[in-house]
Interface confidence: low
């Protein structure tokens, strides 16, 4: 267990002309918060998506009203950080979403209205435990500052918060077969309930005897380290092999720097060196125009003439990302059975089986399920010999084999208008009514049934507000 | 280990108000929503509203209970405050918050408090 | 507001037998459903959240299912401390509800 942690540096304008207007005005006072959105590995960055791994929101910031004539500067932020706590071991590979909303102050009808300001996301690899990275990214003509890191809290240590410590039983040494616990070298590793011999640092187990590897490793222990730097280049396969392996561990192992940046180890840790049009502490921050050809495996760029300005790749059937530097997610082939979540790690797939499974691609049944097939992501659940189908949403029948209309109830309140939705459903609301099924009514008062957590934000289902 | 533990048992008398507190401990406490939950004597359960103690404005209450509870923090002590106004005899309940879980976009609630009794009588 | 309604309102049972306590939604919660178990005098605990998913330290003999507007919480085979009430608690849209309870005595 941990926490992933987010500190806000700076929002606002980008560097180059077409500064964006100010969002808060004299007439229209406003103040900012912020919204993250953290999903484990190589997740969608669809809005709409869970966010698997947690979300937080921020405080609101301070009251902005804007000087007449005055250009847009930096919006003043809320204090303090952003906190996502995660229960199970930090993945290593995540995807973020961060949103900035507006919420303007004046007298509208019914209370406070919020609209989503910014949204940048991406994927980042981050060791628990490191510094803290700083990021830069663009959303339109805005620009968002900011820096993360992850955190083991007590007693979970180590790169993915899977090592425990506790406090030594004798003063002087730790029991038999167990080590120190750095940094807390009072502390001792309590004993490994994963796999025997299962590596504490690149490993992981969720039950007893299993050993799971993180991103960059494989093996049956965890202890084969597998890197792509020095066998595939940023523009696509080299004349190296792919897939090869390197000796390691070090900290250049997988190679952090991206865009093409070359990693060379310092005493402490690491240092990219990045080729011209990137920079920042992993070469992952970009002020690269067309003419340096940034779009990779034969993308097409559009637009950035000029440093300042945002460049576009349109990227050809099977690759992906902001350079076209990603292979299509290989999970797209569902290569995992029986309901299995699939993780695309780069270098292999992995397989998170549902209860019940096991096996690489959770082929294996362990339950009285075997035999019975759910259609259309339906599960099999078991229970004293019996058996039935949880039905994904949108399904139904024994078998999940009937396609439900999520709208043929008329869940939509007030007159608002339903849609089905990959997710369920989302109802859009007619004038004055507001909520996940338009059942709220906004009051003139001043008082709306929502009264402070942004549209969107909890509960679980889809909204859409504005 | 993680524990919310709630003030004493209040009586009141009607149209008054009381505030009942809550201190957390054992987890970062800015960063899971405390909900407010309360029970009649034998009756069953009732969401009252949350607060997200790393925002003490983003809160969310019941329409029910809306225009007389309040609900606020005190990070320095990972204290959260329930008052609830313009007491009547039907709000004797006991009144229990819980810490809700963090996962996806909706919550249930792992840690609850002992209770308090808020008993109104004339 | 999305009323959930438990039954049977008191199902009495043996320590050993399985039980199987219902919970309807008036409306799809898709998997936004909790199951709390409460004792006399004590706060609830929760036992299943998101239909399904375990708790840590919450014994296997409970498990949940279901989908939509439909939910069930199985007891395997009951033991003395089982016998308790029991509510669903439904987190899929605004006010959060709780269903009325099942109460679970020994026959």
């Known amino acids: 267990a941990g926490v992933f942690e987010l500190q806000i540096h700076s929002f606002g304008p980008g560097p180059g002309p077409g500064a964006p207007r100010s969002p808060c005005s004299a007439r229209l006072p406003c103040r900012l918060f912020f919204r993250v959105c953290l999903k484990p590995g190589l997740s969608e960055e669809a809005a709409e998506s869970p966010c698997a791994l947690g979300a937080a929101l921020s405080a609101r910031g301070p009251v902005y009203t804007e000087q007449p004539g005055a250009p847009a500067p930096d919006l003043p932020l809320p204090d303090g950080l952003l906190q996502v706590p995660f229960r199970d071991a930090w993945p290593g590979t995540f995807s973020f979403i961060i949103e900035t909303w507006r919420e303007e102050l004046g007298d509208q009808i019914g209370g406070p209205a919020w609209s989503l300001l910014a949204r940048v996301a991406g994927r980042r690899r981050l060791a628990a435990g490191g510094p803290w990275a700083r990021d830069i990214q663009r959303a339109g003509a805005w620009e968002l500052r900011f820096s993360y890191r992850a955190r083991c809290e007590p007693p979970a240590v180590g790169t993915a918060c899977t090592r425990l410590c506790r406090p030594r039983s004798a003063p002087s040494r730790c029991g038999p077969g167990l080590r120190p616990c750095a940094p807390l070298e009072d502390e001792c590793e309590a004993p490994l309930v994963c796999r025997a011999g299962c590596s504490p640092e690149h490993g992981f187990c969720e039950q007893p005897g299993e050993c799971r590897c993180l991103e960059g490793w494989t093996g049956p222990l965890c202890t084969v380290p597998v890197s792509t730097s020095s066998c595939l280049s940023p523009r696509g396969p080299s004349s190296a092999t792919t897939g090869c392996l390197v000796p390691g561990p070090g900290p250049c192992d997988g190679n952090p720097c991206a865009n093409g940046g070359s990693c060379s180890e310092t005493p402490r840790s690491f240092e990219c060196t990045c080729p011209r049009g990137f920079y920042g502490l992993r070469c992952e921050v970009s002020g690269v125009t067309c003419a340096d050809g940034p779009c990779f495996n034969g993308g097409l760029c559009v637009g950035g003439a000029d440093p300042d300005s945002a460049y576009i790749c349109h990227c050809p059937p099977g690759f992906q990302g902001s350079n076209c530097e990603k292979r299509v997610d290989r999970c797209s082939l569902q290569p995992c059975r029986n309901g299995g979540l699939c993780l695309d790690l780069g270098h292999a797939l992995r397989c998170r089986c549902r209860a019940g499974f096991a096996g690489p691609r959770c082929e294996h049944d362990l339950d009285d399920c075997a035999g019975r097939a759910c259609a259309n992501g339906g599960t099999c659940v078991e229970g004293g010999g019996a058996h039935r189908c949880s039905c994904a949403l949108g399904f139904g029948g024994r078998d999940c084999r009937e396609r439900a209309d999520p709208c043929a109830a008329r869940p939509c309140a007030h007159g608002g208008r339903c849609y089905a939705h990959f997710s369920g459903l989302v109802c859009a609301c007619a004038p004055g009514y507001m909520g996940a099924r338009c059942e709220f009514p906004v009051h003139p008062d001043g008082a709306s049934a929502l009264p402070a957590a942004p549209p969107g934000l909890r509960p679980g289902d889809p909204q859409r507000y504005l | 280990q993680v524990q919310l533990v709630q003030s004493g048992a209040e009586v009141k008398k009607p149209g008054a108000s009381v505030k009942v507190s809550c201190k957390a401990s054992?987890?970062?406490?800015?960063?899971?929503?405390i909900t407010w939950v309360r029970q009649a004597p034998g009756q069953g359960l009732e969401w009252m509203g949350d607060i997200y103690p790393g925002s003490g404005s983003t809160t969310n209450y019941n329409e029910k209970f809306k225009s007389r509870v309040t609900m606020t923090r005190d990070t320095s002590t990972s204290t959260v405050y329930m008052e609830l106004s313009s007491l009547r005899s039907e709000d004797t309940a006991v009144y229990y918050c819980?810490?809700?879980?963090?996962?996806?976009?909706?919550?249930?609630?792992?840690?609850w408090g002992q209770g308090t009794l808020v008993t109104v009588s004339s | 507001e999305i009323v959930l309604t438990q039954s049977p309102a008191t199902l009495s049972l043996s320590p050993g037998e399985r039980a199987t306590l219902s919970c309807r939604a008036s409306q799809s919660i898709n998997n936004n459903l909790h199951w709390y178990q409460q004792k006399p005098g004590q706060a609830p605990r929760l036992l299943i959240k998101y239909v399904s998913q375990s708790i840590s330290g919450i014994p296997a003999r409970f498990s949940g299912s279901g989908s939509g507007t439909d939910f069930t919480l199985t007891i395997s085979s009951l033991e003395p401390e089982d016998f308790a009430v029991y509510y669903c608690?439904?987190?899929?849209?605004?006010?959060?509800?709780f269903g009325g309870g099942t109460k679970l005595e020994i026959k």
């Open positions: 608690q439904q987190t899929n849209a605004w006010p959060l509800t």
């Open positions: 819980a810490r809700e879980t963090t996962v996806g976009g909706a919550y249930a609630m792992d840690y």
């Open positions: 054992g987890y970062t406490f800015i960063s899971y929503w």
